[in-house]
């Protein structure tokens, strides 16, 4: 799913207030709901009819530093016999997410939001049929 | 997938530098990769063997204000005949994502990161069999 554009109005002060100096704003330390938990079913990436693998990307100047990307293992889906069926398609499910980018020059540290496209997993779909012409 | 805890070290200045005053830091306005595009297949939520619906939640003090949550339509998966097969399971694929929470008192505006658990879609899995003892 797509994150709408900011239009940057979200980060502006009300019109009646003095503008933010230097094009930056105050970000409080600490994260709300930091102990939130993902309750995904065990090993769904292997048990799915559209199985996937995970690749981890690491960047120490990004929060979170670790971003996990899924890759569908097959073009088709796995049928009840455990065989690949290419009349169906394994397709990636993508999500736009925000990360925080850290920029520093000596003791001057600033942060900026960054959009990252994450493939979260795969699902099995009936393909769009473009019948033989 | 789970976002690891910050440990808040990410947002701290190097040890040799003076600490951040008032427990806040500088967040630059603007978003890197704002024009990133999601290239998800058309109508996958309806064409999937584990179809889902979307619900939109809206909060003007959150960025993005709109967060879309998926809900699996069925317990089972849709078979080749278009019927639900409860020998398989539709399960949610979840992703932890960051949003920005806006807090204001008069002209004083600050922001804080918040973790949100998003169900991005559903996938069809072979259920875990718990044999009768």
């Amino acid at each position: 799913r797509k994150i709408p554009k900011v239009g940057h109005t979200f980060f502006q002060k009300p019109e009646s207030c003095p503008p933010v100096p230097g094009g930056s704003m105050k970000l409080d330390i600490g994260i709300i709901n930091e102990n939130q938990r993902v309750s995904m079913s065990r090993n769904i990436e292997s048990r799915s009819t559209s199985p996937w693998n995970y690749t981890v990307t690491w960047d120490p100047n990004r929060y979170p530093s670790e971003v996990v990307q899924a890759q569908c293992r097959n073009l088709g889906c796995i049928n009840a016999q455990g065989k690949e069926d290419i009349s169906m398609n394994s397709v990636p499910i993508q999500q736009e997410t925000l990360v925080v980018r850290r920029k520093h020059q000596g003791c001057s540290v600033s942060f900026q939001l960054e959009k990252v496209l994450v493939t979260v997993g795969c699902t099995c779909v009936t393909p769009v049929i473009h019948h033989v012409q | 997938r789970k976002i690891p805890k910050v440990g808040h070290t990410f947002f701290q200045k190097p040890e040799s530098c003076p600490p951040v005053p008032g427990g806040s830091m500088k967040l630059d306005i603007g978003i890197i990769n704002e024009n990133q595009r999601v290239s998800m297949s058309r109508n996958i939520e309806s064409r999937s063997t584990s179809p889902w619906n979307y619900t939109v939640t809206w909060d003007p003090n959150r960025y993005p204000s709109e967060v879309v949550q998926a809900q699996c339509r069925n317990l089972g998966c849709i078979n080749a005949q278009g019927k639900e097969d409860i020998s398989m399971n539709s399960v949610p694929i979840q992703q932890e994502t960051l949003v920005v929470r806006r807090k204001h008192q008069g002209c004083s505006v600050s922001f804080q990161l918040e973790k949100v658990l998003v169900t991005v879609g559903c996938t069809c899995v072979t259920p875990v069999i718990h044999h009768v003892q």
């Epitope: 569908c72 097959n74 073009l75 088709g76 049928n79 009840a80 065989k83 690949e84 069926d85 290419i86 009349s87 398609n89 394994s90 397709v91 990636p92 393909p127 769009v128 049929i129 473009h130 019948h131 033989v132 012409q133 | 290239s39 297949s41 078979n79 080749a80 005949q81």
Partner: antibody, heavy 118, light 112 residues
Framework: QFQLVQSGAEVKKPGASVKVSCKAS????????LNWVRQAPGKGLEWMGV????????SYNQKFKDRVTMTVDTSTSTVYMELSSLRSEDTAVYYC???????????WGQGTLVTVSS | DIVMTQSPLSLSVTPGQPASISCRSS???????????LHWYLQKPGQPPQLLIY???NRFSGVPDRFSGSGSGTDFTLKISRVEAEDVGVYYC?????????FGQGTKLEIK
């Protein structure tokens, strides 16, 4: 008009790799899978695998699984088939073929002759 | 892998006469979705194969109506009602119900 234009003939030594390209035009590239089928001189047709141009997902014939790699470049509407550890029995014409789900392989490239000889 | 067996492997036909090619698969080609993914191709000398019939009995665009396909399960037939000189070449049956996709060994049609 639909067209699949393949790269030219190649001569390779045993143990080498070959990469054949196939450029599609005349239709929406990401709407159709592309297969690779080969035909040894005077012999029948053998399916090697298929790639989904939109996602880059693949399905390979197990016979070639460890030696074949299919890739896609959507910016140029081109798919590639790389075959490694070539042996003399890989001498064949390699065809790139458009495939519509459950219908059939409806349009074929002109073929690329790969000769493996020491 | 599904084995596709064609017969005869060659046939010589007088122009205007009918011809028939049989194709048998080692397993049923009926998919769980009800479709049967059995197709016929013709490879003319010095050319890539071309699609004639898809899903047992559907003629591809531009294919003359003298070509017809029939069959079900594991037994399939391609018929040419009146053979013409341009029909020479090798005919292949192929299945795409199961991975890997497989082809018959080919039937060579010649004109007497």
């Amino acid at each position: 008009q639909f067209q699949l234009v393949q790269s030219g003939a190649e001569v390779k030594k045993p143990g080498a790799s070959v990469k054949v390209s196939c450029k599609a035009s005349g239709y929406t590239f990401t709407d159709y899978n592309l297969n690779w089928v080969r035909q040894a001189p005077g012999k029948g047709l053998e399916w090697m695998g298929v790639i989904h141009p939109d996602y880059g997902t693949t399905s390979y014939n197990q016979k070639f699984k460890d030696r074949v790699t299919m890739t896609v470049d959507t910016s140029t509407s081109t798919v590639y088939m790389e075959l490694s550890s070539l042996r003399s029995e890989d001498t064949a014409v390699y065809y790139c073929v458009r495939y519509d789900y459950g219908d059939a392989m409806d349009y074929w490239g002109q073929g690329t002759l790969v000769t493996v000889s020491s | 892998d599904i084995v596709m067996t064609q017969s005869p492997l060659s046939l010589s036909v007088t122009p205007g006469q009918p011809a028939s090619i049989s194709c048998r698969s080692s397993q049923s080609l009926v998919h769980s979705n009800g479709n049967t993914y059995l197709h016929w191709y013709l490879q003319k000398p010095g050319q890539p194969p071309q699609l004639l019939i898809y899903k047992v009995s559907n003629r591809f665009s531009g294919v003359p109506d003298r070509f017809s396909g029939s069959g079900s399960g594991t037994d399939f037939t391609l018929k040419i009602s009146r053979v013409e000189a341009e029909d020479v070449g090798v005919y292949y049956c192929s299945q795409s119900t199961h991975v890997p996709l497989t082809f018959g060994q080919g039937t060579k049609l010649e004109i007497k």
